[in-house]
């Protein structure tokens, strides 16, 4: 299953399959997730080691048993790949690293006014993988405000150095934020020239394209079909690049197919997995296991659940079957692709779905009336779980926020439905940033069921929590994916990085905002909060957040929206925006429903509604 916990001061011994430099453990974990054989990783921050060569070292590891011995190493961080972790799988990495220079091939230098502008330039340059920016206080005046766009053979820095007044980060192309746009067309009977960066075997041009999209240096590809004249080259997928970023020439060639990486697509990237099953095809590779199962779909599920399995062949040969079950060959290779593809066989083959980010149809958990005042504009995909709950009577308007917690589930505040319990009047918009982008053609979800907490009473602040079951499940994308829930009764975790988001009022007597707002707010202890609200009972099932001096808070229109906190690189839904005295007033923190206290209720309702377990435990 999915394991998300990180091990501090621990280093996995042995099992190395690759190493690289990464700025932090989260980026190292992402590289492990996308590496075909990596199950475990260990990362050495600069503070953990004196050896300059090993600083920022990211070590990717494999293990036949799925685990490795841990040795104590001060400062080291280790953990698991996020294969099998559904919506948590993403190649998108937004963080900017201060005081760090990520080295690589510098191919473009320009003057810009901010690190955000530099990151934007990198994202909009086809060859840029990462960048460094010298701030206005950099010690050498001639380098100040320099934005260096970079690439490297592996897509990660060739070295990382601690350097004051330098900020570094990665291209946001994997976040589907590139302005370049992409070529969706694939071209039959056409071969591209230029430099081959890799060669893999694939059953079709679409798999070839997806592999190209997620390869750090592939910009375009040529695929040789299974009827290509040279038998040894059939099903070969050549991943390519060029200095210019486009093919310098193309040649008409029977039974070849060419196309482009989709990494520069805006708003939508292909999933990093291949779900099609290929009847009459055998995939060759290293044997991991052989098991008898009933049907090719069960074979694919078996492969997906066995984390080291990359692809499979289900044999229908009479000698491989007994009763209704046939042999399911679970296989792997060095590069994650079959080492041989044979056609016209009595088998059916396909790939593990371990990197599919749709995950299962569950709510995400982790094991172990109020808009934003004093906030700033959010950017695309920053808060992909945020939804807008709108009511359509004569006109249509935004009333509340909510959080996507599963394909078919939204968590919000019960008071949003005070006086409006009719599910037909509600429209739920997900994957949006600007309310003004909503037109009559914008897709929305309708409500199948509103589940208000049984102990909630109108005009009381207690148990202000409600679940919405959507009529149809939503697909996950970079802009629309769920937030993980905390573990039941989560009291031990100290959250220091918490944010509230919403389209609500920017001042007490304001109006709904167009762009989704965000504000960083510290949590306040319940004791402190109770002192500020002596006329109300602040219960253990509430959590408070706010600045003593006020100025930043949720407000009308944010109700039901998320209070999220980042811990160990992972966002969790800590609170649901509920109530407060005015907005952003001095010594009047916002009050939020404490999600951890309602985990039993959430799981009971999301499971019983479908009559099947919906629990996904990534840790």
């Amino acid at each position: 299953g999915c394991l998300t916990q990180l091990y501090e001061n621990a280093f996995f011994r042995g099992g190395d399959v690759a190493s690289m430099y990464t700025p932090n453990a989260q980026y190292c974990q992402m590289r492990c997730t996308f590496h075909p054989r990596c199950l475990l990783f260990s990362f050495l921050p600069a503070s953990s080691i004196n050896d300059m060569e090993k600083r920022f070292g990211c070590f990717l590891k494999d293990s036949v048993t799925g685990t490795l011995p841990k040795v104590h190493r001060t400062g080291a961080v280790s953990g698991h790949s996020l294969k099998q972790c559904g919506h948590q799988i993403s190649a998108c990495h937004r963080d900017i690293y201060k005081g760090v220079d990520m080295r690589g091939v510098n191919f473009n230098v320009s003057k810009v006014s901010s690190v955000e502008e530099c990151q934007k330039r990198c994202t909009s340059n086809i060859r840029c993988q990462f960048f460094s920016y010298a701030t206005q206080t950099f010690h050498k005046a001639e380098y100040r405000n320099n934005c260096l766009l970079k690439y490297s053979p592996g897509g990660t820095p060739t070295a990382i150095k601690v350097l004051s007044n330098v900020e570094s980060g990665f291209s946001l192309k994997p976040c589907a934020l590139s302005e370049i746009g992409c070529h969706m067309n694939i071209f039959q009977h056409l071969a591209f020239s230029d430099v081959d960066v890799a060669r893999v075997l694939t059953p079709d041009a679409f798999v070839c394209r997806t592999i190209c999209t997620y390869h750090p240096n592939c910009l375009f590809f040529t695929f040789y079909t299974n009827v290509w004249k040279i038998e040894s080259q059939r099903n070969v997928c050549l991943l390519k690049t060029s200095e210019s970023g486009t093919p310098s020439s193309s040649t008409p060639q029977e039974n070849t197919i060419s196309g482009y990486s989709l990494l520069t697509c805006k708003r939508t990237l292909p999933e990093p997995c291949h779900s099609k099953i290929y009847p009459g095809v055998d995939f060759g590779g290293e044997e991991l296991n052989v098991t008898f199962v009933k049907g090719v779909n069960v074979c694919q599920e078996t492969c997906t659940k066995m984390i080291r399995c990359q692809f499979f062949t289900y044999s229908l040969l009479p000698e491989d079957c007994k009763e209704e079950k046939c042999k399911c060959f679970l296989r792997l290779s060095m590069d994650g692709s079959p080492t041989r593809i044979a056609y016209g066989t009595q088998g059916s083959s396909g790939y593990s779905l371990r990197l599919c980010n749709t995950g299962d149809n569950s709510v995400c958990t982790t094991k172990t009336s109020t808009r934003i005042v004093g906030g700033t504009n959010s950017s695309w995909g920053e808060w992909p779980w945020q939804v807008s709950l709108q009511v359509k009577l004569t006109a249509q308007r935004h009333l509340c926020g909510g959080s996507l917690i599963g394909h078919q589930w939204v968590l919000t505040a019960a008071h949003c439905f005070d006086g409006l319990p009719l599910q037909d009047v509600w429209r739920i918009y997900s994957g949006i940033l600007n309310l003004s982008d909503i037109t009559k053609d914008t897709p929305f979800s309708q409500i199948k069921e509103i589940i208000i907490h049984q102990n909630y009473k109108v005009s009381e602040g207690n148990h202000d929590i409600a679940l919405i079951k959507l009529q149809a499940p939503l697909n996950y994308t970079e802009f629309q994916k769920p937030i993980c829930l905390p573990s039941k009764g989560d009291t031990s975790t100290i959250y220091t990085n918490c944010w509230v988001t919403g389209w609500g009022f920017s001042k007490e007597k304001g109006e709904i905002q167009n762009i989704l707002q965000k504000v960083n707010i510290p949590l306040v202890t319940n004791e402190e909060c109770q002192k500020r609200y002596q006329d109300y009972k602040i219960t253990q099932r509430m959590v408070c957040a706010g600045y003593k001096e006020g100025g930043k808070d949720a407000c009308k229109g944010d109700s039901g929206g998320p209070l999220v906190c980042k811990h160990n690189g992972m966002w969790r839904l800590v609170g649901i925006t509920s109530w407060g005295e005015g907005c952003a007033r001095r010594e009047q923190p916002g009050v939020y429903t404490k999600v951890a206290e309602y985990m039993d209720w959430i799981l009971e309702k999301t499971q019983s509604s479908d009559g099947k377990a919906q629990m996904q435990s990534p840790a």
């Epitope: 067309n185 079709d204 041009a205 679409f206 009827v227 099609k276 009459g280 056609y343 016209g344």
Partner: antibody, heavy 119, light 107 residues
Framework: EVQLLESGGGLVQPGGSLRLSCAAS????????MFWVRQAPGKGLEWVSS????????MYADSVKGRFTISRDNSKNTLYLQMNSLRAEDTAVYYC????????????WGQGTLVTVSS | DIQMTQSPSSLSASVGDRVTITCRAS??????LNWYQQKPGKAPKLLIY???SLQSGVPSRFSGSGSGTDFTLTISSLQPEDFTIYYC?????????FGQGTKLDIK
């Protein structure tokens, strides 16, 4: 030039049999997966059967399973559809089609042959 | 089997109009979606493959888009020869299935 030419259609009584042929030319027939697709009068397209380049595996629509048999003779560049126990609802124009490998579309179709099942 | 639902089943338009035909799959089919045009008494002709790639020789006024379950075929400026029947077809899993067709006729 790629060509597919169906033959063998005609009028047959319910319960009767018919064998359709599709002669292929202009390409290496033995490398391609081939299909039969039919279209009842005034209706849409319906996939009937498919066969791999080497002859196996074969697949059939539920509506024809157990009654129709697809086969091929790569030495003669010919695709066949043996139709037994014919029913009135099998009345249609039958097309043979070539699948373009690795992108899974029918790039070449025959002109079609009409099969009429009626007493 | 995967069901393919085309809408509308018939459509009236004029020469020069921009029209859109939609096709919905009963489950996700990635981009394994093709569009065909069929004229009376003729075999179908491929227009678009892989959801968005234009078959060689097909006029550029035809375009396709979509992935997952929802797809569209757009004809940017209708020509007299475009008034006929259009089918979508999924090639994600056997048996390949077709939509029921959309008949495009002159208003």
């Amino acid at each position: 030039e790629v060509q597919l030419l169906e033959s063998g259609g005609g009028l047959v009584q319910p319960g009767g049999s018919l064998r359709l042929s599709c002669a292929a030319s202009g390409f290496t027939f033995s490398l391609y997966r081939m299909f039969w697709v039919r279209q009842a009068p005034g209706k849409g397209l319906e996939w009937v059967s498919s066969i791999w380049s080497s002859g196996g595996p074969t697949m059939y629509a539920d509506s024809v399973k157990g009654r129709f048999t697809i086969s091929r003779d790569n030495s003669k560049n010919t695709l066949y559809l043996q139709m037994n126990s014919l029913r009135a609802e099998d009345t249609a124009v039958y097309y043979c089609a070539r699948e373009y490998p690795s992108t899974y579309y029918f790039d070449y179709w025959g002109q079609g042959t009409l099969v009429t099942v009626s007493s | 089997d995967i069901q393919m639902t085309q809408s509308p089943s018939s459509l009236s338009a004029s020469v020069g109009d921009r029209v859109t035909i939609t096709c919905r799959a009963s489950q996700s089919i990635s981009t394994y979606l093709n569009w065909y045009q069929q004229k009376p008494g003729k075999a179908p002709k491929l227009l678009i493959y892989g959801a968005s790639s234009l078959q060689s020789g097909v006029p550029s006024r035809f375009s396709g888009s979509g992935s997952g379950t929802d797809f569209t075929l757009t004809i940017s400026s209708l020509q007299p020869e475009d008034f006929t029947i259009y089918y979508c077809q999924q090639s994600y899993s056997d048996p390949y299935t077709f939509g029921q067709g959309t008949k495009l006729d002159i208003k």
